[in-house]
Structure formats: C-alpha cells, structure tokens
Interface confidence: low
C-alpha cells in the first residue's frame, strides 16, 4: 500500500504536485508499512476498541487564510474521553475524583507507556528498536524526552505527507511560497503505541485557504454608537477605522503597507501608511466604503524579456464578493479564482511583487445624540423634620437627536459599584433640556452617571456629587 491509499482523500492530480512542493514533506506515492501501522477500513470493529474507555477526538485548527509566501500553522489537539488526561511523563491517567460512566475514578493509568516493562522497547541499536519507526520506515528522531512522546501524527495535504512524534498535541508549519491559491484540505491521522505496532485512534480533516490577496478585516467604532455591529453610525462624530491584517506568521512585518480609503461621500481618496484612520460623515444616508491595502512582498523575478510590458500601475480590481453560504468567523477571504502561482526557485535577486487586499462595507449614517452635559444641580428643599433621603434636581442638556430614554446610575465615588439604576422614557423640548429628580440615601460622595439614548445612540456624562449632612450650613458640592 502507498500513503495515498491509506490516508484517503481525493487523489491529487500529478500536474499539480510539481507546483506545490512542500519543503521537508514526502510524496504520498511512498510505501506504507502495513505491518507496523495496520490499516483499518471504515466500519472495522477494531476502531471501537482502539482506545480504552471511549473515543479520542482529534481537533485540528489552522491560522488560515494564509497569503502566498507566508507560513501557515496547523495544530492538532487530542481530546481524551471523560476523566482521562496526559501526565507529565506522557502516560494517560484517570483524573482524581472524576466521575465518568464507570463511576468515580481513582488515579490509575489508562496507558502507562513509559514505565518498567516497556523500557526495553526504547533501547538503541538492537533488533528490539526496529519498531521505533514512522509508517514510511524512517526511524524516529530521538531528542531529549522523546520517550514521553506516545503518539505518531501523519499530516497529509497536496499529495504529500509529514510524520511527527508527539504528545497530546502536535504543531506543523508549512511555507506557502510555491502553493496554488485556493482552498485545500489538510487531513491528520493519529496513531498510538500498541505493543510493537501502532494503531490508528483518530482522524480529522479541515479546510485551509491559500490566498493571493491580503486577508483584511476592518473594525469600526464610534463614541456614542449604540450597536457596534450593525454598521449604523452617527453623523458629525468621528468613526475610528482600524485595519487588521491577518498575518499570524508575520510575513508582512518588513513590508511597507499603504491604505487607500474611499469613504463614498465624495470626500475623495485618502492614502495613509497607518492602520487606523478617523473619518466624520457630515450627511445622513448610506455610503459604500472601499479600502484597498497594498504592499510589496518578496516574490519571483520575472524572466528577462525585451518584449515584456511594464507592470500596470493600477491594482487589479477586487473580485465580486459572493455571499458565503456560511460566513466564516474572524478575518476570512475566499480565493479570487484558483489561479496557479507558478513560482520557480527564487534566485538571489531581491524581487518584490505587489499584493493587494480589499475591504468593502455599506454603512448607514443617521442622526444621533452627540453630547450630553449636566447644566445645573439643585438641592430640593425638604419639609422639616428632614427625612433621611436628600432629593436633587439635575438639569441635563444634549446635542443632536432627541433622546427617547434617560438612565441615571448612582454609584460609589469610584463609579465602579452601582447602588441604584433608574431608567425612564423622557419628553424633552426642542432645545434638548430635561430635568431629572433623584434621591440620595444619606450623606456622602456619589458618582452620578446620566445616559441619554435613542435607537442608534447612547451618550453619557458623569459627575461626582457630595451630599452634605443635615447641618443646614453644610453646602452641596458637585465635582465634575
């Protein structure tokens, strides 16, 4: 049997393999050692018994999408059945005082791979260590502590495989410099020691994406905006645009990045070298925001040719973005069409190629409450004998839209611990002036928060107020 027969997934076309060579990986045309690593078909009853106490789940994650030329990292974590864990020696043990289907477990081994009787298995240079090999019969590497590594991980993608010894987690990075843009599948099979052989305990696969566009995500935030996720913002207040470039391998660290903004409001093109930018819309309406990110990255040098025209000065236009049937969390980018980037061996010349990333959003600008302030605080005269509570009248003003609701939160002097919260609908005059009466339970210093809200906005102001004791000569003090 060959690796491709064992590891499954649809066969990878030969003409694609030559463009997608992964350094340090081997062709899945290689022979698989079926004696050392028995192959079980789907539905084979032995899968059920391949792990004591249940099934092991392999969870595969990656930091996809990856820009062509950057590194992409895959991490596999093994999730053991309930109450099982890996100890410091790589053995699998039951957690103390953990209840599973068998009742309470004591601290007994599930698999004690590194203890006593097995030690002979690990000796070098004898026929006894012939089984310390990967499925392609290559011997295991033997760095310090390698005996604690009880699992063999076989990663398989693009018609190639990579073998790795590990504990309950394994990590592999690949460089994408020669890879074709588009979605690919990584599949991982995990084996455990079983006497002098290795049996499969889990298989997992995941999609990853190689892209020739810079993966770009933009966060938009604005003071007083009530809902940051609805892409509705307020007129006459700056919106902070922050560009996040998904570059977990820091491929772009040494590249100068330029950001070209068109806010769709006829204010023209803004070019910046900074990933954050403020912009204020002065009209209500719906606007199409467009961002183009550009950078030059190390790339292949074009073959010398007298007839080669100069590269175009304008970037390629972004592809129309189809609505994904399931939108992916975090910054994501579907490929632009699966173009093959045929990168020959990069010569010593320092050539660079331009890469672009695009972000588009439709944002709605509405009127909102821009500002709220406390104009006046007055003590409400009380009849004698005076009750324990003090009443205060606050005169509050706002700018912008008319609020529909006012909330008052009375807290401790640090403004951290709320003691009382009251919200009520408000009727304000055209000048946005309202009077709010609140009771204070005894003397002392209080933090008073006022928030005025409507559908789109929420504006806040705070003040510290000192309520005097009942001595008629002690004055009311407000500390803004």
């Amino acid at each position: 049997k060959r690796f491709r027969d064992v590891l499954g997934h649809e066969q990878y076309p030969d003409h694609m393999r030559e463009h997608n060579q992964l350094r340090g990986w081997s062709s899945d045309e290689n022979e698989w050692d079926e004696h050392l690593y028995p192959v079980w078909r789907r539905g084979d009853g032995r899968w059920k018994d391949s792990w004591e106490g249940g099934r092991v789940q392999a969870v595969l994650t990656s930091d996809s999408p990856a820009l062509v030329g950057s590194n992409i990292t895959f991490v596999v974590n093994l999730v053991f059945p309930r109450c099982q864990k890996e100890d410091a020696n790589g053995n699998i043990v039951y957690e103390k005082n953990c209840r599973n289907d068998l009742g309470l477990t004591s601290d007994l081994h599930v698999y004690n791979w590194t203890a006593g009787a097995d030690d002979g298995d690990w000796e070098d240079g004898t026929s006894r260590s012939q089984h310390l090999r990967f499925p392609d019969r290559r011997p295991f590497p033997r760095p310090h502590g390698w005996k604690k590594w009880s699992f063999v991980y076989v990663f398989h993608t693009l018609g190639q495989y990579f073998q790795k010894l590990g504990r309950c987690s394994a990590r592999v990075s690949i460089n994408t410099v020669n890879l074709t843009a588009g979605p690919q599948v990584m599949e991982v099979t995990v084996f455990r020691r079983y006497g002098r052989a290795y049996i499969p305990i889990s298989k997992v696969k995941d999609v990853y994406v190689i892209t020739d566009q810079i993966p770009v995500f933009v966060t938009m935030s604005q003071k007083n905006d009530r809902n940051l996720s609805d892409e509705i913002f307020l007129r006459d207040l700056p919106i902070v645009f922050d560009v996040l470039i998904h570059d977990p391998s820091h491929f772009l660290n040494d590249s100068a990045i330029s950001y070209k903004w068109n806010f769709g409001d006829n204010t023209g093109l803004f070019v910046s070298n900074n990933h954050t930018l403020n912009h204020t819309y002065v009209l209500n309406g719906t606007f199409n925001l467009n961002l183009t990110v550009q950078t030059a990255v190390p790339g292949p040098c074009p073959p010398p040719s007298p007839s080669t025209p100069p590269p175009p000065s304008t970037p390629p236009s972004p592809p129309p973005s189809p609505l994904p049937t399931l939108s992916t969390p975090s910054p994501s980018l579907m490929p632009t069409g699966y173009k093959s980037m045929e990168l020959s061996d990069i010569s010593n010349e320092n050539c660079r190629i331009n890469r672009y990333g695009y972000f588009r959003a439709t944002i709605t600008i509405v009127e909102g409450i821009l500002e709220v302030s406390i104009m006046q605080i007055a003590d409400v005269p009380m009849p004698t004998p005076q009750p324990a509570n003090s009443l205060m009248d606050f005169t509050v003003t706002c700018k912008g839209a008319t609020p529909m609701e006012a909330c008052t939160i009375i807290s401790d002097p640090t403004c951290q611990i709320a003691q009382n919260r009251v919200c009520s609908p408000v009727a304000v005059d055209g000048l946005c002036l309202l009077s709010v009466r609140r009771a204070f339970n005894g003397s002392g210093t209080y933090c008073v928060n006022f928030t005025l809200g409507d559908d789109a906005s929420l504006a806040l102001t705070s003040t510290l107020i000192s309520i005097p004791g009942k001595d008629p000569d002690s004055p009311l003090r407000a500390v803004n």
Partner: antibody, heavy 120, light 107 residues
Framework: QLQLQQSGTEVVKPGASVKIPCKAS????????MNWVKQRPGKGLEWIGQ????????NDNGKFEGKATLTVDKSSNTAYIQLSSLTSEDSAVYFC?????????????WGQGTSVTVSS | SIVMTQTPKFLLVSAGDRVTITCKAS??????VAWFQQKPGQSPELLIY???NRYTGVPDRFTASGYGTDFTFTISAVQAEDLAVYFC?????????FGGGTRLEIK
C-alpha cells in the same frame, strides 16, 4: 437554488429496514458533510452521524451503531440513511442537513424531513 | 458524550420583551456551539455558529456569546414570528449533542 430534497413519509413494519434518500442540489455536494438528525414527536433533536461525500469518510454517534448506515451516491448527489431492525422507538422524523468541512457541526441547510412510522 | 443542559424549558413572553436562554456543557467545548430555531411544523434553521457568529440573513436581534462550558442566547426584542423552539448544540466533540430545547410562546 440550494435544496435538500427528502421523501415525505415511510410506513414500515417492525423488524424491517428502510433507506431514506436526501437529494442535494445547488452546491458542491462533495465538499460538505451531510448530517442526519432524528426527532421523535414532541421531542428534541438527536444527531445520528455525518458522511463526507468527497471520500466517504463517516463520523458516527455510537448510539446508532448497527441501527443506521450512512452512504452517498456522488453521481446523483444523493445521501442515504438506512435504518434496520426497526422498532416503534425508530418512529420519528429524520432530517438530512449539510455542514461545511471546517465547521462540521454547524448545519446551515436542512431537508424538510422524512417521517418514518413503524407499525404492524 | 457531552451533555448540553438548556434552560429554561419554556418561556411565555410579550412582544418586545428581551429573552435569554442558557446552555451549559458538561465539559469544555471551546466555542464550538450553534443555536437553531425550529418553528412549528418546520425544519430547524441555523441562527448562530461558533458561539457568537450570526448566520447570513439572521436579524440582529438574535445574539449569542460564551466559551468553554457556559453559553447564552438572547433575543433583544421578541417579535410574533419568533414563536419557536430554540436548541443549542455542541459540535466540538463527537457525537454532537443538542440541548433539550426551549419553547418560546408569545402572550
């Protein structure tokens, strides 16, 4: 447009078997997991298992071992669930639902369900 | 298998009310939780995936959050058409399991 078409109702005798189809259209059938979910009348949802048409890989709920077999026919873009040795406990609505490879449990499109009644 | 304990089982609310449903996993499921809505006589529909991501076309009154073992699902202002049963589901660990469901009824 995207559709998962299931047969309407199946009435079968105790001890018999039934094979329920789910015909997919409007998307790349081989690139999504196909899940099967059981719902007894007035009850919750129970995940039976999933199959990846690209290579026939399956991921099963051990509770249904020996009861449910998942298969696909890529030429007709159809997934099947075969239920065997039927009893009254198997009377339920069976839904097929697809999920993307990278979010294999997030079932974003569902068939309308096939009602199976086991009755003598 | 992982048990998803969903509360409450039943909610009777008025249009415009805010509703919160919680789901507790018997062990950590990272953020691999989905929320489904099933209207009477219909198939379930995906509302939320990966704990907090709203699926395409789902109104923004539906939100969710959580990580590990504790998850919440909120409808900020219930509308008449939200009458349905709501299910949480973990898809971190096979077999994938659903909560028992919350039946939402409108006064």
């Amino acid at each position: 447009q995207l559709q998962l078409q299931q047969s309407g109702t199946e009435v079968v005798k105790p001890g018999a078997s039934v094979k329920i189809p789910c015909k997919a259209s409007g998307y790349a059938f081989s690139s999504y997991w196909m899940n099967w979910v059981k719902q007894r009348p007035g009850k919750g949802l129970e995940w039976i298992g999933q199959i990846y048409p690209g290579d026939g890989d399956t991921n099963d709920n051990g509770k249904f071992e020996g009861k449910a077999t998942l298969t696909v026919d890529k030429s007709s873009n159809t997934a099947y669930i075969q239920l065997s040795s039927l009893t009254s406990e198997d009377s339920a609505v069976y839904f097929c639902a697809r999920s993307p490879l990278h979010l294999r449990g997030s079932m974003d499109y569902w068939g309308q369900g096939t009602s199976v009644t086991v009755s003598s | 298998s992982i048990v998803m304990t969903q509360t409450p089982k039943f909610l009777l609310v008025s249009a415009g009310d805010r509703v919160t449903i919680t789901c507790k996993a018997s062990q950590s499921v990272s953020n691999d939780v989905a929320w489904f809505q099933q209207k009477p006589g219909q198939s379930p529909e995906l509302l939320i995936y990966s704990a907090s991501n709203r699926y395409t076309g789902v109104p923004d009154r539906f939100t969710a959050s959580g990580y590990g073992t504790d998850f919440t699902f909120t409808i900020s202002a219930v509308q008449a058409e939200d009458l349905a049963v709501y299910f949480c589901q973990q898809n971190y660990y096979s077999p994938f399991t659903f909560g028992g469901g919350t039946r939402l009824e409108i006064k």
